[in-house]
Interface confidence: low
C-alpha cells in the first residue's frame, strides 16, 4: 500500500494473507470462502493445498494467526493468464469453517443497490501487506482511502504504451489520485477494495486488487480493481454448487479450472 | 305306538372370555365390546403425541387376539409420550429449553439463537416444537437446523472498536 497508514485491530477483520509462490491477499466471505484475484493463485493451480492462508493478524510475520487451508480453488473461466486481467477473480474454498470474532469477520458482497456507494469520487479503502513507498513489503497491515476514478478517464490512462489497447474492461474499476501517491501495489493483489454501505452500516467488497502501472502511486495512473458486482451470480453459483460448509479436511485439494485455461509463461504484473 | 327316535345329546361349548382390555394411559381400545371371546381382537391407538411401545421397542401398530385359553396373545403396550430427544447442537449458536430444563417431549419448545454480534440466524426464527412424528420442527415446518450465518462487514473503523 502506497501512501497509507497502519491498520488497527478489528479495522479489516476480513483481511486474509495468502502465501504461495508470492505474497498476496484475499477477503473472507462467509466463514469458509476467500475471495481473491485469479492471478494471485494461478501459479498454485497444480497444488492448491500448498496455499498457506492466514487470518486474524495484523503483522505479516507474526506467529499468532489463524491458519486455514484450501480445499479447492475456483478460477473464473473467462480469466486468461497471458492476455490481460479481464475476469481476474477467484474463490478459495477453505477445508474448515473459521470461528468468527472481532479479528476475523467476513466482508459483505455488494447488494444490488451498492452501485450508489461506488460512484466516481466515492471513497473506497484498500488494505494489504504489499510494497510501500519505501520499497519493502509492509510488516504491519496497511490501508489507504482512495476515490473511485471515472471509468473513461481510467481507460484513457491505460490506452497509451506500454499498455495494450483495451486493457481496462467493463469488468474493472479504477481508484486513486490523479496526483498519485496513494495506491495499492505488488503484494496487495487479491485484497479487497471496500466501501461502506451507509444504509446498513456494513462494509462490502467493491473491488479486488488486480493490476496497475509499472510504478505504484504514479501520477496520472490508477490502481485497477476487479469489479465485484459484475460477478455476484458467478460467486453465488459456486458457493451454492460447492457447498457452504467446509468438509473438515481429508482428500487432496482441488484446483477447479475446467474452463479453457491456457498454460503460459508467467508475466510478472505488479499487483 | 311310541316312536323310537333315540337319544339327543346337546353339546355346548363356552369359549373363555378374555380379560377386558384396559387401555393404557393416553391410549384407547378399538373396537370396544362388552365381551371378547376366542378370535376376537382389539387394537390400541395412542393419542397424538404418544407412541406405542412394547418394552423398549416402538410398534407401528398393535392388535391382540383372544386365545382359546382366555388369554390375550400379546401384552398390553404402553402409549409413551413422543420424545424428540436432545436437540442437535447449532454451530456458532446455542439452544435454550423453553418448556422446562431438558424437556424434550411432545409439544416441548426450544429456542435456538446465534452467538451475538458475529452471527445472525437464517432460515427461520429459531423456535422449534417437538411434534408427534418425533422431530423438532420450526414454525415453518422445517425439520433441519436453522443456520447461524456470520455477520459480514463489521469493522472497528465504523463501530469504534468492539
Amino acid at each position: 500500500i502506497y501512501g497509507g497508514q497502519k491498520a488497527k485491530p478489528g479495522d479489516f477483520p476480513w483481511q486474509v494473507l495468502i502465501l504461495g509462490g508470492t505474497t498476496a491477499a484475499g477477503a473472507l466471505l462467509y466463514d469458509n470462502w476467500v475471495l481473491t484475484a485469479a492471478h494471485a493463485v494461478y501459479e498454485q493451480k497444480h497444488d492448491a493445498s500448498a496455499l498457506d492462508i492466514r487470518m486474524g493478524t495484523l503483522k505479516r510475520l507474526s506467529p499468532h494467526y489463524t491458519q486455514a487451508w484450501s480445499e479447492a480453488v475456483f478460477i473464473h473461466e473467462g480469466y486468461t493468464h497471458d492476455a490481460g486481467f479481464d475476469n481476474d477473480i477467484a474463490l478459495i474454498k477453505l477445508n474448515n469453517k473459521v470461528v468468527i470474532n472481532s479479528n476475523i469477520t467476513p466482508i459483505c458482497l455488494p447488494r444490488k443497490e451498492a452501485e450508489s456507494f461506488m460512484r466516481t469520487d466515492d471513497i473506497g479503502t484498500a488494505s494489504g501487506w504489499g510494497l510501500t513507498q519505501r520499497g519493502f513489503l509492509a510488516r504491519n497491515l496497511m490501508y489507504v482511502d482512495i476515490p473511485i476514478v471515472d471509468h473513461q478517464k481510467c481507460t484513457a490512462a491505460y490506452e497509451k504504451p506500454p499498455y495494450p489497447r483495451g486493457s481496462v474492461t467493463a469488468n474493472m474499476l479504477c481508484a486513486g489520485l490523479e496526483s498519485g501517491g496513494k495506491d495499492s501495489c505488488r503484494g496487495d493483489s487479491g485484497g479487497a477494495l471496500v466501501f461502506l454501505d451507509s444504509e446498513t452500516e456494513r462494509w462490502f467488497v467493491g473491488g479486488i486488487v488486480s493490476w496497475g502501472s509499472m510504478n505504484c502511486g504514479e501520477a496520472g495512473q490508477y490502481g485497477v480493481y476487479t469489479k465485484v458486482i459484475n460477478y455476484i451470480p458467478w460467486i453465488e453459483n459456486i458457493i451454492s454448487d460447492f457447498g457452504g460448509g467446509g468438509s473438515g479436511g481429508g482428500g487432496s485439494a482441488k484446483f477447479v479450472a475446467a474452463w479453457t485455461l491456457k498454460a503460459a509463461a508467467h508475466h510478472h504484473h505488479h499487483h | 305306538m311310541a316312536s323310537m327316535t333315540g337319544w339327543k345329546i346337546h353339546y355346548t361349548s363356552t369359549a373363555h372370555a378374555c380379560p377386558y382390555p384396559m387401555a393404557p394411559p393416553n391410549g384407547h381400545v378399538s373396537p370396544v365390546q362388552a365381551k371378547y371371546i376366542l378370535k376376537d381382537s382389539f387394537s390400541i391407538f395412542c393419542e397424538t403425541g404418544y407412541e406405542l411401545l412394547q418394552g423398549h421397542l416402538p410398534l407401528k401398530s398393535f392388535t391382540a387376539v383372544c386365545q382359546k385359553d382366555g388369554s390375550w396373545d400379546r401384552p398390553m403396550p404402553a402409549c409413551s409420550i413422543v420424545d424428540c430427544g436432545p436437540p442437535d447442537d447449532l454451530p456458532s449458536g446455542r439452544v435454550e429449553y423453553i418448556t422446562g430444563p431438558g424437556v424434550t417431549t411432545y409439544k416441548a419448545v426450544i429456542q435456538y439463537s446465534c452467538e451475538e454480534t458475529f452471527y445472525t440466524m437464517k432460515v427461520n426464527d429459531g423456535k422449534y416444537v417437538c411434534e408427534a412424528d418425533g422431530f423438532w420442527t420450526s414454525s415453518k415446518g422445517e425439520k433441519s437446523l436453522p443456520v447461524c450465518e456470520p455477520v459480514c462487514g463489521l469493522s472497528a473503523r465504523t463501530t469504534g472498536g468492539r
Epitope: - | 393404557p24 394411559p25 418394552g55 421397542l57 388369554s71 398390553m76 403396550p77 404402553a78
Partner: antibody
C-alpha cells in the same frame, strides 16, 4: 424352576477388564429381555444395562456407556457383561436379571422378576 | 434421569403392625413403579409391579398404590420375615432408576 447363575467376578485393578457370565435355565430364555443390575457394598440397587430378547438393541446407564457391553447367546441360554476400563466406583455385586417376558400381561417391560444370587466385582489397586 | 426418593430411610415397627412405605418420583411416571424386597445376603425379590399389580407367589398382605409422582407400598400386618430393605424402581424412562431404599426393622 427359574435359575440364573452369575460367574466371572473377582478382584481387578483400575483400568482392567472382566467378563461376567450368566447361565439361565428353567424358562424360555429367548422370550425375555435380560438385564444386569448392580449393588455397591452397603448401597442401593443400580440398573446397569439391558438387552432385548432377540439381541437387537442394548441400553446402558450413562456412567458405563462405552466401557461396558451387554450381549447374549440365545443358543447357549447365556447373558454376558464385558467390562473394560474398570473404575473403583464399579465395585459392586452384579446381578443378572430377567426383565419380564416379552409375551406377558402388562403395559411395559422394565421390572426385574427373576434374579441370580450375584457375583462380586472388586476394582482396587 | 428420574430420581426416586424413598421415605422414611428406616421404619421401626413390630410384627402385626401395618407398614406404609413411600416413594416419590422427581417427575410423573404414570404407574410405572415396581417394588422389591431384599434381605441381607440375598438378591432382591419383586413384590408389586405397575404400582399396584400383585405378583404370583407374593403374600396378599403386600399391596401398592399411587400414580404420577407419589407411591405407597403397604404391608397390612407385618410378619417376622418381612423385616428387610424395600426398594422402588421406575420404568417410565428406559434409564431405569431405583430409590435409595427403606429399611424396615423390628422395633
Amino acid at each position: 424352576e427359574v435359575q440364573l447363575v452369575e460367574s466371572g467376578g473377582g478382584l481387578v485393578q483400575p483400568g482392567g477388564s472382566l467378563r461376567l457370565s450368566c447361565a439361565a435355565s428353567g424358562f424360555t430364555f429367548n422370550d425375555y429381555n435380560m438385564a444386569w443390575v448392580r449393588q455397591a457394598p452397603g448401597k442401593g440397587l443400580e440398573w446397569v444395562a439391558t438387552i432385548l430378547f432377540d439381541g437387537s438393541r442394548t441400553y446402558y446407564r450413562d456412567s458405563v456407556k462405552g466401557r461396558f457391553t451387554i450381549s447374549r447367546d440365545n443358543a447357549k441360554n447365556s447373558l454376558y457383561l464385558q467390562m473394560n476400563s474398570l473404575r473403583a466406583e464399579d465395585t459392586a455385586v452384579y446381578y443378572c436379571s430377567t426383565e419380564s417376558p416379552y409375551y406377558s400381561e402388562g403395559y411395559y417391560q422394565g421390572y426385574f422378576d427373576y434374579w441370580g444370587q450375584g457375583t462380586l466385582v472388586t476394582v482396587s489397586s | 434421569e428420574i430420581v426416586l426418593t424413598q421415605s422414611p430411610a428406616t421404619l421401626s415397627l413390630s410384627p402385626g403392625e401395618r407398614a406404609t412405605l413411600s416413594c416419590r418420583a422427581s417427575q410423573s411416571v404414570s404407574t410405572s413403579i415396581h417394588w422389591y424386597q431384599q434381605k441381607p445376603g440375598q438378591a432382591p425379590r419383586l413384590l408389586i409391579k405397575y404400582a399396584s399389580r400383585s405378583i404370583s407367589g407374593i403374600p396378599a398382605r403386600f399391596s401398592g398404590s399411587g400414580s404420577g409422582t407419589d407411591f405407597t407400598l403397604t404391608i397390612s400386618s407385618l410378619e417376622p420375615e418381612d423385616f428387610a430393605v424395600y426398594y422402588c424402581q421406575q420404568s417410565y424412562s428406559s434409564l431405569y432408576t431405583f430409590g435409595q431404599g427403606t429399611k424396615l426393622e423390628i422395633k
